[in-house]
Amino acid sequence: AMDLILINSLPLVSDAETSLTCIASGWRPHEPITIGRDFEALMNQHQDPLEVTQDVTREWAKKVVWKREKASKINGAYFCEGRVRGEAIRIRTMKMRQQASFLPATLTMTVDKGDNVNISFKKVLIKEEDAVIYKNGSFIHSVPRHEVPDILEVHLPHAQPQDAGVYSARYIGGNLFTSAFTRLIVRRCEAQKWGPECNHLCTACMNNGVCHEDTGECICPPGFMGRTCEKACELHTFGRTCKERCSGQEGCKSYVFCLPDPYGCSCATGWKGLQCNEACHPGFYGPDCKLRCSCNNGEMCDRFQGCLCSPGWQGLQCEREGIPRMTPKIVDLPDHIEVNSGKFNPICKASGWPLPTNEEMTLVKPDGTVLHPKDFNHTDHFSVAIFTIHRILPPDSGVWVCSVNTVAGMVEKPFNISVKVLPKPLNAPNVIDTGHNFAVINISSEPYFGDGPIKSKKLLYKPVNHYEAWQHIQVTNEIVTLNYLEPRTEYELCVQLVRRGEGGEGHPGPVRRFTTASIGLPPPRGLNLLPKSQTTLNLTWQPIFPSSEDDFYVEVERRSVQKSDQQNIKVPGNLTSVLLNNLHPREQYVVRARVNTKAQGEWSEDLTAWTLSDILPPQPENIKISNITHSSAVISWTILDGYSISSITIRYKVQGKNEDQHVDVKIKNATITQYQLKGLEPETAYQVDIFAENNIGSSNPAFSHELVTLPESQAPADLGGGKMLL
């Protein structure tokens, strides 16, 4: 994924502006690209620091521009260096005066170990001086003045890696600024070999590509791409995936491209000459125009791309039949993807012919890490590579690159990934209220750590010390009731926030623990409420035998019906009664009771009672005599509630008889409201009185009632409603 390119625009310096541009194409360097003077190659060059600026036309590129007035200080060797994941890559180049006495045949020369090499300089200026040749700034050879040829050569019959370096030529009276430079690159291995011991065979690197002696990979010349450099780029493009473009009016004219060793420097395809400003002659193409077209079937030769094959033909010389190769294209990849941190499965989809295979599709992270597909499938028209990042994190945000490299060419598509932090509540939920089977919770979803917006919220809960999975409910409001909980159980609660997108579930927030109440004991049995005095009521119940050994007590609640007066009394569990005192006379009270342990029990039904009266009872009302026969009659009445009436007395006697000859009928159930008098005489008049009795005494009747029985043969009158004592 590391594609570093150094463009030396006009290595022969005259009075025109000249520059070095270093481009990191297809990867994002961890550290800035650096451009510096290569003192290893030339120790005694100018010491001035370089003014390195950002190349505004490209995202990851640095530039040094020398104005024409600085021409005298430019001569020398330079490097560009980029670093990614601890690996450094350095590209070297040189600049020299166009007015130098000699000029090199080429700026760099790559040879294989053992090659027979001639390093040549062309004499441009004739001087009556000895010519001298230096290597890396050290003198190695001289030619007497009268023997200096038109082509000055250094001959290396069996080039070795130690022969590599910057060779310079000048007249003895000259200096660095009149020197010509060329750099010899000697591959560590012999031709077509690679490996630490140079005993592996290189793949064919077409179109003047160079086999890297350490890895066996092809370094492709500017204008060609693919594993074997077979595929020509579109016009005026370069780089490992041909996505960099020459912006000049005539494309890549006057651009010298320098690539990592062992490639060195060359013109872009279609150009030649030291300044790369000469077009290829007809029939030639490629970098430095070194490749000759030998197109079959009279196909046309293009100086940039070589043979332009007719449909149905392919290969360098259009020698192979078959579907013409199509440069891969990456499709359906958005420019920007928002991703939630966690697992991420990016997809790279590409077309082309032949269809890309899984090993030809990679994904490059912003730090330069190359990922290979975890899954791969293809249809008739597309290859789909699925990658897996098990844990993508915010630092992984940035420009990622989908890269496809087939025999038909290479393509890369950068896209921006923005990794979001999953939201997590800062606070635990709060428990507002609990019962034995429910809890009311404030989920406290804000504030939260991480990125919004929040799409949904979940309240997670489970019993502590249970191996159960967390249960959850979707929550819309901040207050939520959890139902169907187990009694007397400790629960854990937390909140999970969900943001938009796949895998948007954040980590659950802090945990809150709470315990549900126990199920309450049943109320006391046999409850009975009776008045004891004008200010007391007595509540009694049956003895309580609880099923657990927990401490318990009876809670009695009494409240007045007439007044807003309520009291709760705790009674030890071993008692069976309580006296409710300090009450008001002639007042109705509602009482209920429950048995409590740590948990509260269930309330009993309400019991109602009046305290005893402090006054005489009122006289019974609505007294009616009905259903009169010759020997009986029915008397009915009503009494007022609240006077502690304990009994009703009916007193009757035959009219005219003495007072002491009366009969008293005492009805001790005050709820009875009618009574049938029997054993009366026919056709007799009776005087009837009725009294109410309470704890104070009897009511005072205002008047007596008369009752006359019928003769023996007559039918009775209708009987009134109400309870009747027979």
């Epitope: 630490p196 005993n199 290189c202 793949t203 064919a204 890895t215 066996g216 990979e217 025999v407």
Partner: antibody, heavy 117, light 113 residues
Framework: QVQLVQSGGGVVQPGRSLRLSCAAS????????MHWVRQAPGKGLEWVAV????????YYADSVKGRFTISRDNSKNMLQLQMNRLRSEDTAVYYC??????????WGQGTVITVSS | DIQMTQSPDSLAVSLGERATINCKSS????????????LAWYQQKPGQPPNLLMY???TRESGVPDRFSGSGSGTDFTLTISSLQAEDVAVYYC?????????FGQGTRLEIK
């Protein structure tokens, strides 16, 4: 998809000859070096021979040197292994393979050679 | 020639457990000039050709599950399967390509316990 399809296996008597073929598709065959690797029954993998992309360079394992010849016909996308003076220890499954650097990336399906009298 | 020795010869591991296969070379396969180890790992299932898993000792080949990882440097290398799956039952080979001829380890048979 890159494919290597092998043919030419069989049973042969010791001292006789046999020719194995490997047809490549889905790649520019003429750009790649090609290997032969073999695996004796129940045994591990043993590298046999390699040929450069242009056929100029050929290397052999000591165990087959002088008896086996690796060759290629780039016009037909075809790799061959000519095996002469076969021995019983040459009995194996033979695989052709394309390299990715020094590792072997694409393998043929294998062809069985049995050398037996 | 560089000799490659694998250990153990066979290995039985429970499903979901970690499997570790070792490979030792008779000389270093680390190339100092680029700090790369010239070592590959292969998986071979019965009746099938070997399948490239790793190269440069730790670079996973595309399509290989990430439960496979390679480590080590110089002469000692390890292939690790973090959580064994049923489909991982196979013979595993290491191979050096530091020097020709390329040579393979004798193989490690991995089975389910």
């Amino acid at each position: 998809q890159v494919q290597l399809v092998q043919s030419g296996g069989g049973v042969v008597q010791p001292g006789r000859s046999l020719r194995l073929s490997c047809a490549a598709s889905g790649l520019t065959f003429s750009n790649y070096a090609m290997h032969w690797v073999r695996q004796a029954p129940g045994k591990g993998l043993e590298w046999v021979a390699v040929i450069s992309y242009d056929g100029e360079n050929k290397y052999y394992a000591d165990s087959v040197k002088g008896r086996f010849t690796i060759s290629r016909d780039n016009s037909k996308n075809m790799l061959q292994l000519q095996m002469n003076r076969l021995r019983s220890e040459d009995t194996a499954v033979y695989y052709c393979a394309t390299p990715k650097g020094g590792a072997l990336e694409i393998w043929g399906q294998g062809t069985v050679i049995t050398v037996s009298s | 020639d560089i000799q490659m020795t694998q250990s153990p010869d066979s290995l039985a591991v429970s499903l979901g457990e970690r499997a570790t296969i070792n490979c030792k070379s008779s000389q270093s396969v680390l190339f100092s000039s680029n700090n790369k180890n010239y070592l590959a790992w292969y998986q071979q299932k019965p009746g099938q050709p070997p399948n490239l898993l790793m190269y440069w000792a730790s670079t996973r080949e595309s399509g290989v599950p990430d439960r496979f990882s390679g480590s080590g440097s110089g002469t000692d290398f390890t292939l690790t399967i973090s959580s064994l799956q049923a489909e991982d039952v196979a013979v595993y080979y290491c191979q050096q390509y530091y020097s020709a001829p390329i040579t393979f380890g004798q193989g490690t048979r991995l089975e389910i316990k």
